[in-house]
């Protein structure tokens, strides 16, 4: 498995992982105690046929070409968690590992 | 986690799982000995904001709205393997569990 990494200067048009810092403070999400911001990353770009396809299934659906199938799109194929400290609905402070908060790899699926 | 299930008669426009039988014989993929066909399913439909979002990350990227982020798309969020019997490149018969061949659930990511 591999995926492309890009930045704001890249001319890559294909599916790629781009850096993105999520700033909870800027969103006004003040129930999040820590971190106030973190590197989340995001996926963007075109999915030409077969390029960076995560699953054989994607190729098979392309072959079968059913009505309404839009073709693969650039989406996270590997994600990782971050540890967070936040208030829950009962105003208790919670420390927990929140899954799928960081995009590690992008692909076409 | 849940996802919508549709069929060819559905009027649902949102992200949904549709039935699809993949026929290896029709593709001419004769290196696959068995199965000759299987129920693969596929994802299709629109991803309105927050509908069927698999990850909090999807919501955060929408909030941050970076250049080039296309918004979530309807993609498999749960997949399962099938057992297959096939010839490898060395013309040996292989029995194996092939991952991510069946879409069990669709969502927006």
């Amino acid at each position: 498995d591999f995926g492309l990494d890009c930045d704001e200067h890249s001319t890559e048009s294909r599916c790629c992982r781009y850096p993105l810092t999520v700033d909870f403070e800027a969103f006004g999400w003040d129930w999040i105690i820590a971190p106030k911001r973190y590197k989340a990353n995001y996926c963007s770009g075109e999915c030409e046929f077969v390029f960076l396809q995560k699953y054989p299934h994607t190729h098979l659906v392309h072959q079968a070409n059913p009505r309404g199938s839009a073709g693969p799109c650039c989406t996270p194929t590997k994600m990782s968690p971050i540890n967070m400290l936040y208030f829950n609905g009962k105003e208790q402070i919670i420390y927990g590992k929140i899954p799928a908060m960081v995009v590690d790899r992008c692909g076409c699926s | 986690d849940f996802g919508l299930d549709c069929d060819e008669h559905s009027t649902e426009s949102r992200c949904c799982r549709y039935p699809l039988t993949v026929d290896f014989e029709a593709f001419g993929w004769d290196w696959i000995i068995a199965p000759k066909r299987y129920k693969a399913n596929y994802c299709s439909g629109e991803c309105e904001f927050v509908f069927l979002q698999k990850y909090p990350h999807t919501h955060l990227v929408h909030q941050a709205n970076p250049r080039g982020s296309a918004g979530p798309c309807c993609t498999p969020t749960k997949m399962s393997p099938i057992n297959m019997l096939y010839f490898n490149g060395k013309e040996q018969i292989i029995y194996g569990k092939i991952p991510a061949m069946v879409v069990d659930r669709c969502g927006c990511s």
């Epitope: - | 014989e25 004769d30 290196w31 000995i33 199965p35 000759k36 297959m84 019997l85 010839f87």
Partner: antibody
Amino acid sequence: QVQLVQSGAEVKKPGASVKVSCKASGYSFTGYFMHWVRQAPGQGLEWMGNIYPYNGVSNYNQRFKARVTMTTDTSTSTAYMELRSLRSDDTAVYYCARRYYYGTGFADWYFDVWGQGTLVTVSS
Amino acid sequence: DIQMTQSPSSLSASVGDRVTITCKASQDINSYLSWFQQKPGKAPKSLIYRANRLVDGVPSKFSGSGSGTDYTLTISSLQPEDFATYYCLQSDEFPLTFGQGTKLEIK
């Protein structure tokens, strides 16, 4: 419908060779193993071997390995079984049969269709 | 090679009878056993596969059972068209081997 049609009866002299054909129709010929089975007059069935037409991979019964060759012509969807150095005890009806997989395990199959048989008589 | 011993080698029965044919393998064949019917001058016809599964289109009066090394074919109510020779086949390993056959005759 799926059908296997074999070539006509043959009379051969000892030491000669015979090539029996089996023409398939009604399915994708290249994607199914073809087996050959023979039956001597008044006797039981004996497996000779098989071939996968897509790539020509074959597997022979050790008893016949030195004398048998199985081939296919995918352009005409025909399987062939050639037996060399014929002896009188090779007199038999030769059948082709298609192997159909109902599952994905190595042995998850059965013979779903048979050819009508070809009588080969070896006599001086 | 796996030896398949079929018994009896011949059997006389009447229309309406229930008959059982057995097949014994020289080693465990993991239920990879098929049964065939053959009529004079005709190709064999598959009846049962994987020891107990009925081939599509075969009447339910035919049934198979067994596991390990011992297997049986049962015909619940014999009809005139059922008088034929029956063979078992093991497909657990190569070479494939058949039983020697059971000739079912009208009494």
